[in-house]
């Protein structure tokens, strides 16, 4: 049993290593923000008993401006993504070869495959090492990751920024 | 061969800074996101930066103000710079990055370096 991708948090990003049952994880926020006194970053992959059904605890998490750091860019507005529009991120290497799904190409490497569900944010669902990740879509609420559709997702080993209603089934800059 | 080499490591005195490198090879695809997180004995790897392809950037509350994750797409590099190194710093640093291919639908790839031991003496 696994958790679906976390709900967003305003202002607050997120990177899973784990979807798996009882994992725990911290969400961060954006630069210009701080944690609010009080208020916990914390969440946890929990199972409901009743339903059966694995869903992550909603953290208090509040992110608020930081004067302090007026000097660190704030994060950029999110725009609302189109699923079915090939994502455009930037491109960090010029290589043009296609990665093979199946087979990772080194032991630190976890390899997903993409299933885009209409509607939303591209947000795959599971864990760390290989498996297949089914994307659900979900418009992005705050001003975490948000460019372009492909951006928040995460994968494998990690998820970010990743809003609720995405279907576990293999969870997965420029200066 | 993906590779990712984290390089920039070593004993560093408490109040001095430290530029953590992450030299990405092979990389299949496109850049999406990246980030650095850390991990100590006996504890939780932890996030510690996040940079969005799109250029939001999020930090852990135990490094705002001290650490800036940034990236050099000529060099197909990540980088972290640590300034204000305190004891409690001391950890093994791993880089992260996620890609996507580019047919549709995009697979979604996520790779790992090995980490680099960062130490921190009071």
């Known amino acids: 049993i696994t958790c679906p991708p976390p709900m967003s948090v305003e202002h607050a990003d997120i990177w899973v290593k784990s979807y798996s049952l009882y994992s725990r994880e911290r969400y961060i926020c954006n630069s210009g923000f701080k944690r609010k006194a009080g208020t916990s970053s914390l969440t946890e992959c929990v199972l409901n008993k009743a339903t059966n059904v694995a869903h992550w605890t909603t953290p208090s998490l509040k992110c608020i401006r930081d004067p302090a750091l007026v000097h660190q860019r704030p994060a950029p507005p999110s725009t609302v993504t189109t699923a079915g529009v090939t994502p455009q991120p930037e491109s960090l290497s010029p290589s043009g070869k296609e990665p093979a799904a199946s087979s990772p190409s080194s032991n630190n490497t976890a390899a997903t495959t993409a299933a885009i569900v209409p509607g939303s944010q591209l947000m795959p669902s599971k864990s760390p090492s290989t498996g297949t990740t089914e994307i659900s879509s979900h418009e992005s609420s705050h001003g975490t990751p948000s460019q372009t559709t492909a951006k928040n997702w995460e994968l494998t080993a990690s998820a970010s920024h990743q809003p609720p209603g995405v279907y576990p089934q293999g969870h997965s800059d420029t200066t | 061969e993906v590779q990712l080499v984290e390089s920039g490591g070593g004993l560093v005195q408490a109040g001095g800074s430290a530029r953590l490198s992450c030299a990405a090879s092979?990389?299949?695809?496109?850049?999406?996101?990246t980030a650095w997180f850390r991990q100590t004995p006996g504890e939780q790897r932890e996030v510690v930066a996040i940079?969005?392809?799109?250029?939001?950037?999020s930090y852990a509350d135990f490094v705002k103000g001290r650490f800036t994750i940034s990236r050099d797409n000529a060099q197909d590099s990540v980088y972290l710079q640590m300034n204000g190194l305190k004891p409690e710093d001391t950890a093994i640093y791993y880089c992260?990055?996620?890609?996507?291919?580019?047919?549709?639908?995009?697979?979604?790839?996520?790779?790992w370096g090995q980490g680099t031991q960062v130490t921190v003496s009071s």
């Open positions: 940079r969005r392809s799109g250029g939001n950037i």
């Open positions: 092979g990389i299949p695809g496109t850049l999406n996101d």
């Open positions: 992260a990055i996620a890609v996507f291919s580019r047919d549709f639908p995009p697979k979604r790839y996520e790779y």
